[in-house]
């Protein structure tokens, strides 16, 4: 059977700019071209998203950090661990769009 | 000072297939012309999203509901709750993708 | 989780002004109204008027134009309510809550705050 | 401004009741109708919004219901946890609460 109706206040505080986990795919040319292949092929990062309440805001973040993360990098004959650095938003705000 | 380094096992396993949190815009065309304004204009639901260990496989989902959710319809002279289903993906799985 | 942690009680003369903030934490500030809402004892609830971090707008209940000045401060989310010319009729519990965008509906409340005005 | 009207300013109960509290808007207000329960000395605690949406983490035996200018909250099997104020609102035009509460005692 079909669940119960999510509550709007719910759906509300949900759907609204914060920071939230979005996947990042992985670029090769980052790496050069000794490497054959990243894994993962994607990363999970935090970043500002969702909705503002009115159309004339848009979702931006005021608090960012770099996240270090272990990626492995197979390359032939020998494959090793790499580190890649990427943007994670802590804080958002639903600010006026620019003209 | 800069965080630590996300290990790579932390790093694979975020990353990979499986059901996660993404926002999805609202169409104000579902709602007919007499609605102004949606709110909030987006939601969340639960999708199947992440990378697979392989290029030829593709992240699906092999489970999924409707989910009911409560949203404000901005009409004139009232508002009102009105309800939308959307597909929630609740298992998901690395396949070969489709030639 | 979401918290409206409000400043403590205040004991003022009458003719003077007063400031009680109200500090948010664990959700987007921007993203919810601000409300202001007074309790005097032993009686209803009377809204004073909300203020939107996002755009700054404000809107007062007419019968206290004047009285209340709401403000915040996004980088802090911090809300403000600023009471001036104070008289006995001021005192009361004020309470600042918050809700969505367009339906007035408050779902997190501060503690209240305690305003006495005496000579 | 709308004026919303709470007749009943006591209501007696007992433990295991239904009791049904009741709010008449001086004008049509659609379906923009919140109830709230307060305890001494406490914040007031969102129950039900517009008119029939029972808030996260509420109770079922809290039902509202209603439409235009006549709300009703009800309580079945009522807990001496229930024993409170209950306020009611409309955000229809700008916001007024009840002119009052209804206050819930046992009999």
């Known amino acids: 059977h079909q669940k119960k109706v999510v509550p709007w206040i719910d759906v509300y505080a949900r759907a609204t700019c914060q920071p939230r986990e979005v996947v990042v795919p992985l670029s090769m040319e980052l790496m050069g071209n000794v490497v054959k292949q990243l894994v993962p092929s994607c990363v999970t990062v935090q970043r500002c998203g969702g909705c503002c309440p009115d159309d004339g805001l848009e979702c931006v973040p005021t608090g960012q950090h770099q996240v270090r993360m272990q990626i492995l990098m197979i390359q032939y004959p020998s494959s090793q661990l790499g580190e890649m650095s990427l943007e994670e938003h802590s804080q958002c705000e639903c600010r006026p769009k620019k003209k | 000072h800069q965080k630590k380094v996300v290990p790579w096992i932390d790093v694979y396993a975020r990353a990979t297939c499986q059901p996660r949190e993404v926002v999805v815009p609202l169409s104000m065309e579902l709602m007919g012309n007499v609605v102004k304004q949606l709110v909030p204009s987006c939601v969340t639901v639960q999708r199947c999203g992440g990378c697979c260990p392989d290029d030829g496989l593709e992240c699906v989902p092999t489970g999924q509901h409707q989910v009911r959710m409560q949203i404000l319809m901005i009409q004139y002279p009232s508002s009102q709750l009105g309800e939308m289903s959307l597909e929630e993906h609740s298992q998901c799985e690395c396949r070969p993708k489709k030639k | 989780q979401v918290q409206l942690q409000q400043s403590g009680p205040e004991l003022v003369k009458p003719g003077t002004s007063v400031r009680i903030s109200c500090k948010a934490s664990?959700?987007?500030?921007?993203?919810?109204?601000i409300h202001w809402v007074k309790q005097r004892p032993g009686q209803g609830l009377e809204w004073i008027g909300w203020?939107?971090?996002?755009?700054?707008?404000?809107n007062y209940n007419e019968k206290l134009k004047g009285k209340a000045t709401l403000t915040a401060d996004k980088s802090s989310s911090a809300a403000y309510l600023q009471l001036n010319s104070l008289t006995s009729e001021d005192s009361a519990v004020y309470f600042c809550?918050?809700?969505?965008?367009?339906?007035?509906?408050?779902?997190?409340w501060g503690q209240g705050t305690t305003l006495t005005v005496s000579s | 401004d709308i004026v919303m009207t709470q007749s009943h300013k006591f209501m007696s109960t007992s433990v295991g009741d239904r009791v049904s509290i009741t709010c008449k808007a001086s004008?049509?207000?659609?379906?923009?109708v919140a109830w709230y329960q307060q305890k001494p000395g406490q914040s007031p605690k969102l129950l039900i919004y517009?008119?029939?949406t029972r808030h996260t983490g509420v109770p079922d035996r809290f039902t509202g219901s209603g439409s235009g200018t006549d709300f009703t909250l009800t309580i079945s099997n009522v807990q001496s946890e229930d024993l409170a104020d209950y306020f009611c609102?409309?955000?229809?035009?700008?916001?007024?609460f009840g002119a009052g509460a209804t206050k819930l005692e046992l009999k």
């Open positions: 517009w008119a029939s």
């Open positions: 809550t918050r809700s969505p965008y367009y339906g007035y509906v408050f779902d997190y």
């Open positions: 609102q409309q955000y229809s035009s700008s916001l007024t």
């Open positions: 004008q049509d207000v659609g379906t923009a």
């Open positions: 203020f939107y971090p996002g755009n700054v707008n404000t």
């Open positions: 664990g959700y987007t500030f921007t993203t919810f109204y």
